[in-house]
């Protein structure tokens, strides 16, 4: 899989490029410099920076917590009026307690009604989610295996035979019509049977070409 090994024998280099073992490393390999430079930041400086970052994060969390407290305070102040007890005697205070208790009972009733609605909505959402999963189950897509190939081989596999057509993979994979559902299900079965045969690049090429 590694390329350029013959060149390495003829021309010795001061820092050889790291051997790519996976195609997933390709992008990183292309963007990174071949010779890795040693970090100029000392361990103590790194620790200092880490501590600083932690401090900033802590301050940010504290600020968020303070904001939440402030928001709660603001919300409560709009809902709960400050008690006006000046000039009220025992009789009024007693009656005020009765009024406030009645208000609490009313709010409790409303809360119960809202909770019932929320529970109903949660149940409906769960049912709909289940229906979505059930519908998805009818149109299973093949699970593609990761294949270790070079970038050139991959480009050839993708563009070689069908260079003229655009590579809109979604269009290829998602063209499902209602009348073809049975056919699709049969295909899914075939995929499972021939999974080993199709796991190679040739098999994948065949699938794209069909």
């Amino acid at each position: 899989m590694a390329d350029g090994s013959s060149d390495a024998a003829r021309e010795p280099r001061p820092a050889p490029a790291p051997i790519r073992r996976r195609s997933s490393n390709y992008r990183a390999y292309a963007t990174e410099p071949h010779a890795k430079k040693k970090s100029k930041i000392s361990a103590s400086r790194k620790l200092q920076l880490k501590t600083l970052l932690l401090q900033i994060a802590k301050q940010e969390l504290e600020r968020e917590a303070e904001e939440r407290r402030g928001e709660k305070g603001r919300a409560l102040s709009t809902r709960c009026q400050p008690l006006e007890l000046a000039g009220l005697g025992f009789a009024e205070l007693q009656d005020l307690c009765r009024q406030l208790h009645a208000r609490v009972d009313k709010v409790d009733e409303e809360r119960y009604d809202i909770e019932a609605k929320v529970t109903k909505n949660i149940t409906e959402i769960a049912d709909l989610t289940q229906k979505i999963f059930d519908l998805r189950g009818k149109f299973k897509r093949p699970t593609l295996r990761r294949v270790r190939i070079s970038a050139d081989a991959m480009m050839q596999a993708l563009l070689g035979a069908r260079a003229k057509e655009s590579l809109d993979l979604r269009a290829h994979l998602k063209q499902v019509k209602k009348e073809d559902t049975e056919k699709e299900n049969r295909e899914v079965g075939d995929w499972r049977k021939n999974i080993d045969a199709l796991s190679g690049m040739e098999g994948r090429k065949k699938k794209f070409e069909s």
């Epitope: 400050p82 000046a86 005020l96 009024q99």
Partner: antibody, heavy 121, light 107 residues
């Protein structure tokens, strides 16, 4: 000098509505709870309504609850009594009074001159 | 509701007399009892609050006493300006209630 002046009274038919006003002066109005008390033609005194200093809380006897509404405007030093669905038994002299308390005891320490309301068909 | 009752609706007395007006509550009102005076012109004034406290500007000839359910207002050395109707009011429970009043007249 503490003073209360009522206005807005009159003669009206049963089922009618009326709004009484009371202009207060001579004291820091917003520091006191206020009340309305009426006196029937038989000279009986009946407490009608009380409102807290900022207007958040109001108190009524069952006889007027749901029909009468006490309110206040601290900026204008004015107390109001909105009366709806008036009945013949609401016929009375309506007094505006400053309310105070001592060790929890509730009393009206200063009263206005009254405003007459007559409900008759 | 707490009912307030006075022993007599009217009372006759002579100038200089000591007059006592009584008031009873249908239940214990813990001294939350107030007395008012209404003059013939309709003017209402607070005289006594919390059973025995004299309101500012009120003559010391007026005094109040009592506890539990029984209370009284006393006018010592009755004067012409005291001729009025006197009401008691409980400040213990909503609704605040008044008695029917005692009309004080000269003999």
């Amino acid at each position: 000098e503490v003073q209360m002046v009522e206005s807005g009274g009159g003669l009206l038919k049963p089922g009618g509505s009326l709004k009484l006003s009371c202009a207060a002066s001579g004291f820091t109005y917003s520091n006191y709870a206020m009340s309305w008390v009426r006196q029937t033609p038989e000279k009986r005194l009946e407490w009608v309504a009380t409102i807290s200093t900022g207007g958040s809380y109001s108190y009524y006897p069952d006889s007027v609850k749901g029909r009468f509404t006490i309110s206040r405007d601290n900026a204008k030093n004015t107390l109001y009594l909105q009366m709806l669905s008036l009945r013949s038994e609401d016929t009375a002299m309506y007094y505006c009074a400053r309310k105070d308390n001592y060790y929890g005891s509730t009393f009206m320490d200063y009263w206005g001159q009254g405003s007459s309301v007559t409900v008759s068909s | 509701d707490i009912q307030m009752t006075q022993t007599s609706s009217s009372l006759s007395a002579s100038l200089g007399d000591r007059v006592t007006i009584s008031c009873r509550a249908s239940q214990d009102i813990t001294q939350y009892l107030n007395w008012y005076q209404q003059k013939p012109d309709g003017t209402i004034k607070l005289l006594i609050y919390y059973s025995s406290r004299i309101h500012s500007g009120v003559s010391s000839r007026f005094s109040g006493s009592g506890s539990g359910t029984d209370y009284s207002l006393t006018i010592s050395n009755l004067e012409q300006e005291d001729i009025a109707t006197y009401f008691c009011q409980q400040g213990n429970t909503i609704p605040l209630t008044f008695d029917t009043g005692t009309k004080l007249e000269l003999k």
